[in-house]
Interface confidence: low
Amino acid sequence: HRRLDKIEDERNLHEDFVFMKTIQRCNTGERSLSLLNCEEIKSQFEGFVKDIMLNKEETKKENSFEMQKGDQNPQIAAHVISEASSKTTSVLQWAEKGYYTMSNNLVTLENGKQLTVKRQGLYYIYAQVTFCSNREASSQAPFIASLCLKSPGRFERILLRAANTHSSAKPCGQQSIHLGGVFELQPGASVFVNVTDPSQVSHGTGFTSFGLLKL
């Protein structure tokens, strides 16, 4: 049985050899071969080469995908904790403290106010803001928290917004706002959180936090 296989292999090998020899003869323009014959052989050969090249490309693609799944696609996640600030700015301040997460340098906390990503992709971005306010002490306007995006070379834009009316509790009533959504971020994009009155934000453990996760 094995011997028959061997003969079959040798026959195939001989046919391949004859085919290659014929191509050589076509190229040198031997008169014994008709032009039609040569054209047919050449197109057959080109077809083989094309198939080989296509296979090579597919293998390359598969390999590069494997790389992306591993080295090229590290986990990117951040979770930062609110930081009381003497600044009067409406942009909330955050810190790498307590139970925070900063997976690697592909996401960074810049100037304590914005999370900046280095890789393009879909990210789940969230913020929880707890505030304590009183209807009488506050203006008529509700307490508004906004999740904002600043992409390189573009204007800032609001991604998410939530509003709560002030409590009647005294001295103030605690309320929480949670914002969260999936957004496409470009390399160098920054996200930050704005509130109408930062002095009302609660900075106790676990009350106010901000983060993102690359999907």
């Epitope: 930081e83 810190a95 790498e96 403290k97 925070y100 900063m102 304590g112």
Partner: nanobody, 123 residues
């Protein structure tokens, strides 16, 4: 192997200034919170200051707030403590300490310490 090497200590007059340095090696410096801790002669350890991996935020003990400044240069793997308006009670051996945790932090839990550098404030 993790190594922390302090330098910059010495004798200084009250009201004077000193800058301590701590050269770190053997770990990814920028990922970890770092602290300065001191021990005055015959006393226990006292936490002085802490800085996060990125350099923000920084924390200080009430006894040094407004006089000491902690900073770091992640490109040089070095931690600093700038000490101004020094007082006699600042006399101590100053240690730099690496936080035990990187991603999830617990304040003032350290796994590596330097050998310390002595700061003496005296006229």
């Amino acid at each position: 192997e993790v190594q922390l090497l302090e330098s910059g200590g010495g004798l200084v007059q009250p009201g004077g200034s000193l800058r301590l340095s701590c050269a770190a090696s053997g770990f990814t410096f920028e990922l970890y919170r770092m602290s300065w801790v001191r021990q005055a002669p015959g006393k226990g350890l006292e936490w002085v200051s802490e800085i996060s991996g990125s350099g923000f935020p920084t924390y200080y003990a009430d006894s040094v707030k407004g006089r000491f400044t902690i900073s770091r240069d992640n490109s040089k793997n070095t931690l600093y403590l700038q000490m101004n308006s020094l007082r006699a009670e600042d006399t101590a051996v100053y240690y730099c300490a690496k936080s035990l945790h990187d991603k999830t932090q617990h304040h003032q839990e350290f796994d590596y310490w330097g050998q310390g550098t002595l700061v003496t404030v005296s006229s």
